[in-house]
Amino acid sequence: AWELTILHTNDVHSRLEQTSEDSSKCVNASRCMGGVARLFTKVQQIRRAEPNVLLLDAGDQYQGTIWFTVYKGAEVAHFMNALRYDAMALGNHEFDNGVEGLIEPLLKEAKFPILSANIKAKGPLASQISGLYLPYKVLPVGDEVVGIVGYTSKETPFLSNPGTNLVFEDEITALQPEVDKLKTLNVNKIIALGHSGFEMDKLIAQKVRGVDVVVGGHSNTFLYTGNPPSKEVPAGKYPFIVTSDDGRKVPVVQAYAFGKYLGYLKIEFDERGNVISSHGNPILLNSSIPEDPSIKADINKWRIKLDNYSTQELGKTIVYLDGSSQSCRFRECNMGNLICDAMINNNLRHTDEMFWNHVSMCILNGGGIRSPIDERNNGTITWENLAAVLPFGGTFDLVQLKGSTLKKAFEHSVHRYGQSTGEFLQVGGIHVVYDLSRKPGDRVVKLDVLCTKCRVPSYDPLKMDEVYKVILPNFLANGGDGFQMIKDELLRHDSGDQDINVVSTYISKMKVIYPAVEGRIKFSTGSH
């Protein structure tokens, strides 16, 4: 028998520095977790102790903090090289700055293979990108070889900006021939490494003949065997065992997100490359693990540019941006309108001639808007200003909901109106009318939504049984502020871009902004 140790990360999302337990900015260093310096300490410790070790990343290193905003992927290549990653799969967020924003900073600079078998380049891009990412890579490990085959969510065109010259194929259809090719090359130990979410990971384990292990990402899935060491609740045991269609046990793993854990999986193979057994657990990277001094020093050196960036002007406002709780928790506020407009603008994807866009709606809890911005400072807006408005380091995500769920959400928005509570919703692509004289749960008297399957966008009444795409904060997608119906009833959830980054990009693009209060939210009494 031959033993392999797989160390893995996924959905790190720009958390190069250590973070607090909830993966936001580190405040009390003695309680902080993760970060590449601490990760390196643990990886090196395992490399020294064990003979056959692979360090893999399942995508979405891009996007999530000011590190990505400023360095645009150069930081990912630099620190992943420093940690000596063995391979990475492309995630959807790797395309956030377009194909060029992937090729130049990452693909050309990475000293490790970057993989995806289901992304096919066409047209002029095919020659430009050729060899910069691969469908699979055969890695020597000790005296053996291990094949790593990559995959990426086929929803990427709806979630990011891969452009028109990349085709995202069905994962299973694309993986099988590549695995077959590895088998003909006498590679008998094969890891599928990819970024399509836990459900697809399990399907790959079940359906792709010859895959021995699946290392996944995208769904931020936390798996654990035994008593979990922090706040994350396990979605299942680690590894999660899938029975393949041919009757094998195929271990499937994921390691939550944000670099908080290092996935640790030990696989025992027989002489024919079949998995005999697998066991392990994610390792919580808490403060009991010291940060590596040389990596930490490098982080501090790179950090300097971030502090300078925070105070630079992104754009100007010529109106007061009312983000006060007195406004945003009671009525339509122009800061809410600005943020929602930025959220929709960030999700413009013309992927189908029948649709002007795939999503037109935004909802945003008023309680998530934490500060106004005064225009009487020469109109200047900085990252620092936006960090006061959106201090929680969240993301603006894409969900699919039934109309009936949206209706419940808007009823919840005003179920205890007048108490300055955070659940009052700001909106984009939605016209809502409330009648507060009616009893809670029955106060929404009109709810019109902007069409997507139209050449001239207009507002139509919400249909209860129709499925709608909506952009909203991850806080709401996870049921925050009492929006349990969203969490319980959502049909799909894809995590999006860092909230501040979305708004800062929009302001930079617009240069001068003047959001108004324009009748998106209205109140009526009696018949309207």
Epitope: L203, Q206, R248, D270, N274, I276
Partner: antibody
Framework: QIQLQQSGAELARPGASVNLSCKAS????????MQWLKQRPGQGLEWIGA????????RYTQKFKGKATLTADKSSSTAYMQLSSLASEDSAVYYC?????WGQGTLVTVSA | DIQMTQSPSSLSASLGERVSLTCRAS??????LNWLQQEPDGTFKRLIY???TLDSGVPKRFSGSRSGSDYSLTISSLESEDFVDYYC?????????FGGGTKLEIK
């Protein structure tokens, strides 16, 4: 080619135990679930349980917990099922099976 | 445990006829369903795995499909050797479970 060779017919007294074997060849014995099934004359199939020889993991249908015990010997690529406290309703043909290959079955007859 | 309800339990049909057997799953089993054939001498053969994939060597007249929680085995044109017993098996979660079986008889 893949073969599952089961042991011969068993005649046993009520209350006794029998040990059925299933010798596997032509594939990696440790890396596939081995299932055991029961079929009484003229009846349908019942799924008893399965063993994963690589790590010894076993799964049983509730009804057969305590009745059947599954083991595997990696060195001889043989799976075993012991049936204990035999009663007349245990008289049946027992099959070992992979997902795509089946043994020829072992007839167990329980009679006083 | 997941219940698999197989229907019909017996079926009389003629040579060349098209027939369908159905298994209904009590819970979601995805595509984790096999169809098995048992000869009169007790030997078993898997016809279809993963709901719709034909095993090698199985004639093309056999096909598998799914509609919601209903899984079907269709034989497009019956031949004499097809008049045997058929079972579905779900392997989505332990304990695996069989349908009650269908006896296909010649009219």
């Amino acid at each position: 080619q893949i073969q599952l060779q089961q042991s011969g017919a068993e005649l046993a007294r009520p209350g006794a135990s029998v040990n059925l074997s299933c010798k596997a060849s032509g594939y990696s014995f440790t890396s596939y679930w081995m299932q055991w099934l029961k079929q009484r004359p003229g009846q349908g199939l019942e799924w008893i349980g399965a063993i994963y020889p690589g790590d010894g993991d076993t799964r049983y249908t509730q009804k057969f917990k305590g009745k059947a015990t599954l083991t595997a010997d990696k060195s001889s690529s043989t799976a075993y099922m012991q049936l204990s406290s035999l009663a007349s309703e245990d008289s049946a043909v027992y099959y070992c099976a992979l997902f795509s290959y089946w043994g020829q079955g072992t007839l167990v007859t329980v009679s006083a | 445990d997941i219940q698999m309800t197989q229907s019909p339990s017996s079926l009389s049909a003629s040579l060349g006829e098209r027939v369908s057997l159905t298994c209904r799953a009590s819970q979601d089993i995805g595509s984790s369903l096999n169809w098995l054939q048992q000869e009169p001498d007790g030997t078993f053969k898997r016809l279809i795995y993963a709901t719709s994939t034909l095993d090698s060597g199985v004639p093309k007249r056999f096909s598998g499909s799914r509609s919601g929680s209903d899984y079907s085995l269709t034989i497009s044109s019956l031949e004499s050797e097809d008049f045997v017993d058929y079972y579905c098996l779900q392997y989505a979660s332990f304990p695996y479970t069989f349908g009650g079986g269908t006896k296909l008889e010649i009219k």
